[in-house]
């Protein structure tokens, strides 16, 4: 069956300066390919985190994505600022040249509250 990307939270609220976790789990690791987090949709979407060797300031993975059976691709955003507000999507790709997007989570809206 086709892999599903599940983002259980519709929205999260976080105070500026605090950290928040955006949850994402997959039903399968197949087909082989990367998982990436984006803010927004379409051509203007912004890459927030990729479960690869790249480094992203203030964004970290919650569990060890290198473990073979791990299906949790949640991320933690630290020191949240008002500019971090928006809808975040966890997206599964199939490896190729280039990688092909095959499934997206439903999105989690991040609301940033004044401290």
């Amino acid at each position: 069956t086709e892999v599903k990307v599940i983002q259980p939270e519709k929205s999260v609220s976080v105070a500026a300066g605090d950290s928040t976790v955006l949850n994402c789990t997959l039903t399968s690791l197949l087909p082989v390919g990367p998982i990436r987090w984006y803010r927004g949709v379409g051509q203007s979407r912004q890459l927030i985190y990729s479960f690869t060797t790249e480094h992203f300031p203030r964004v970290t993975n919650v569990s060890d994505a290198t473990k073979r059976s791990n299906l949790d691709f949640s991320i933690r955003i630290s020191n949240v600022t008002p500019e971090d507000a928006g809808t975040y999507y966890c997206v599964k790709f199939q490896r190729g040249s280039p990688d092909t997007e095959i499934q997206s989570g439903g999105g989690t809206e991040v609301y940033v509250l004044a401290k």
Partner: antibody
Framework: EVQLVESGGGVVQPGRSLRLSCAAS????????VNWVRQAPGKGLEWVSL????????YYADSVKGRFTISRDNSKNTLYLQMNSLRAEDTAVYYC????????????WGQGTLVTVSS | EIVLTQSPGTLSLSPGERATLTCRAS??????LAWYQQKPGQAPRLLIY???SRATGIPDRFSGSGSGTEFTLTISSLQSEDFAVYYC??????????FGGGTKVEIK
């Protein structure tokens, strides 16, 4: 106090149509996703359809896809369910249910309206 | 689609007794599970969400536990108003949202 009041139920012949309404009050209607959930006589709960606060996101149960249409009018604080090509198995009490703002569980329900499909 | 199976179908108990209701999921729903109570002729009422958090105004004799695929709703000491049908619902997966088949708690 949150209030959800359904109307529009009744007896209808198979193949005919019916439109249900749900009037909402006591909360900012446009900020919440709302659903229709039904319950056949003596049976359990069955989720029917969901519409997001803006109306942009819509889902249906496979059992009603292509026959039922969910919509909302945020200026009137009202949710609708247009039911076409009705079948005997659509006979049920139809509830409108307001979702929690963070998760897809239901923290408020209407009292329900009975739809009976019979010749 | 995630299937929820509730057991037993009917529970016959006396007031003051402890009721234990079970809900099993066909795959893990983590703690994204809610419980509802429904009395005859009434709409369902939210009791528990997040597997173990009581909804506003719900008495503390109701408690929920579990995670993953196995969940329990416990009523520590049944009151007359607790005799009803109880449903679990998962909200982990995006729609279709699914309910269990229900457990009827009746007076013995």
């Amino acid at each position: 106090e949150v209030q959800l009041v359904e109307s529009g139920g009744g007896v209808v012949q198979p193949g005919r149509s019916l439109r249900l309404s749900c009037a909402a009050s006591g909360f900012t209607f446009s900020s919440y996703d709302v659903n229709w959930v039904r319950q056949a006589p003596g049976k359990g709960l069955e989720w029917v359809s969901l519409i997001s606060g803006s109306g942009e996101i819509i889902y249906y149960a496979d059992s009603v896809k292509g026959r039922f249409t969910i919509s909302r009018d945020n200026s009137k604080n009202t949710l609708y369910l247009q039911m076409n090509s009705l079948r005997a198995e659509d006979t049920a009490v139809y509830y409108c249910a307001k979702e929690n703002n963070r998760y897809r569980f239901f923290d408020d329900w209407g009292q329900g309206t009975l739809v009976t499909v019979s010749s | 689609e995630i299937v929820l199976t509730q057991s037993p179908g009917t529970l016959s108990l006396s007031p003051g007794e402890r009721a234990t209701l079970t809900c099993r999921a066909s795959q893990s729903v983590y703690t994204y599970l809610a419980w509802y109570q429904q009395k005859p002729g009434q709409a369902p009422r939210l009791l528990i969400y997040g597997a173990s958090s009581r909804a506003t105004g719900i008495p503390d004799r109701f408690s929920g536990s579990g995670s993953g695929t196995e969940f329990t709703l416990t009523i520590s000491s049944l009151q007359s108003e607790d005799f009803a049908v109880y449903y679990c619902q998962q909200y982990y997966d995006r729609p279709p949202l699914t309910f269990g088949g229900g457990t009827k708690v009746e007076i013995k």
